[in-house]
């Protein structure tokens, strides 16, 4: 029961996780499907159960080892297959010669915190999570600040073209509530994409001192 278009997309978090999404117009909702991973130069293989995320797409995470273990390198190729049960047999529905370091999507930055806040500026720091030591300093960040009365989509993007895990936000309004998010991307990889946005960090600027111009 397959017709129309299809897609199979996977990303490596640079350490021990490959996340996959498979979409298939006209596929049966109650079909049991899995992603199988066979690296070309490793002794292990791995399987995950595809679970529905929408009407015609399924997702799963291949957990390759402990979160911070370096399970794959730039020379690895992992054969990924989508297998769906059809009666008593498994059918191959998709296949990919997956080059992990060409298809990177890191975990969202974590541990956001306000280092210092004033009336018009705020210094914020964060950490990257489960990022390979292979990148050294070859990472970039995007940040955005949610101002009162605006949406995240309207927030201008601030680009940090180097591995800088802090930012000083300026020209803020005194005594105002803001939210801040950041995301990260390695410079390496033809199909590499941005990490998800971090959890928002809420902060409030200090009120202006009474009797002073602001």
């Amino acid at each position: 029961a397959v017709n129309g278009t299809s897609q199979f997309t996977c990303f490596y978090n640079s350490r021990a996780n490959i996340s996959c999404v498979w979409s298939q117009d006209g596929a049966l909702q109650d079909t049991s499907c899995q992603v199988h991973a066979w690296p070309d130069r490793r002794r292990w293989n791995q399987t995950c159960e595809l679970l529905p995320v929408s009407q015609a797409s399924w997702a799963c995470n291949l957990i390759l080892g402990a979160p911070d273990s370096q399970k794959l390198t730039t020379v690895d190729i992992v054969t990924l297959r989508v297998l769906c049960r059809e009666g008593v047999r498994w059918r191959v529905m998709a296949i990919q010669d997956f080059k992990p370091f060409e298809n990177l999507r890191l975990m969202a930055p974590i541990s956001l915190q306000v280092v210092h806040v004033e009336t018009h500026r705020c210094n914020i720091s964060w950490e990257i999570s489960q990022a390979s030591h292979y990148f050294e300093r070859h990472l970039e960040f995007e940040a955005r600040t949610l101002s009162p009365g605006h949406t995240w989509e309207e927030a201008p993007l601030l680009t940090l073209k180097q591995k800088q895990e802090w930012i000083c936000l300026e020209t803020l309004t005194p005594d105002t509530q803001y939210e801040f998010q950041v995301r990260v991307k390695p410079l390496q990889g033809e199909f590499t994409t941005w990490s998800p946005w971090s959890q928002p960090l809420a902060f409030r600027t200090k009120p202006a001192a009474l009797g002073k111009d602001t």
Partner: nanobody, 122 residues
Framework: QVQLQESGGGLVQPGGSLKLSCAAS????????MSWVRQAPGEGLEWVSY????????HYADSVKGRFTISRDNAKNTLYLQLNSLKTEDTAMYYC???????????????RGQGTQVTVSS
């Protein structure tokens, strides 16, 4: 638009051989992995073999491994499947399919040819 035209099918005795071709047009052939799939009478579609964009990596279903060989000629925009040691259970309509990228393919009627019939019978 994408066009795929299979040819080379026919009637052959068990143990015999055939070579299927798939002429591709409407897209940059070398930028896409390609697969052969087949459908036996009254059965669902079965993936047979896959080759990546530059022809350096191939994969086969267990049922055809060691008997079938997939190849491609990017200069001619043509995909091939050499079928050897044919069995009656290889009887099916054979289709070529355009992949998603240089390195991937997913079963999709939207990028499939009209097929060529292979019949293995004594």
């Amino acid at each position: 638009q994408v066009q795929l035209q299979e040819s080379g099918g026919g009637l052959v005795q068990p143990g015999g051989s055939l070579k299927l071709s798939c002429a591709a047009s409407g897209f940059r052939f070398s930028n896409y992995g390609m697969s052969w799939v087949r459908q036996a009478p009254g059965e669902g579609l079965e993936w047979v073999s896959y080759i990546n964009g530059d022809g350096s990596r191939t994969h086969y279903a267990d049922s055809v491994k060691g008997r079938f060989t997939i190849s491609r000629d990017n200069a001619k925009n043509t995909l091939y499947l050499q079928l050897n040691s044919l069995k009656t259970e290889d009887t099916a309509m054979y289709y070529c399919e355009k992949g998603l990228s240089r390195d991937g393919w997913s079963l999709s009627a939207a990028s499939r040819g009209q097929g060529t019939q292979v019949t293995v019978s004594s």
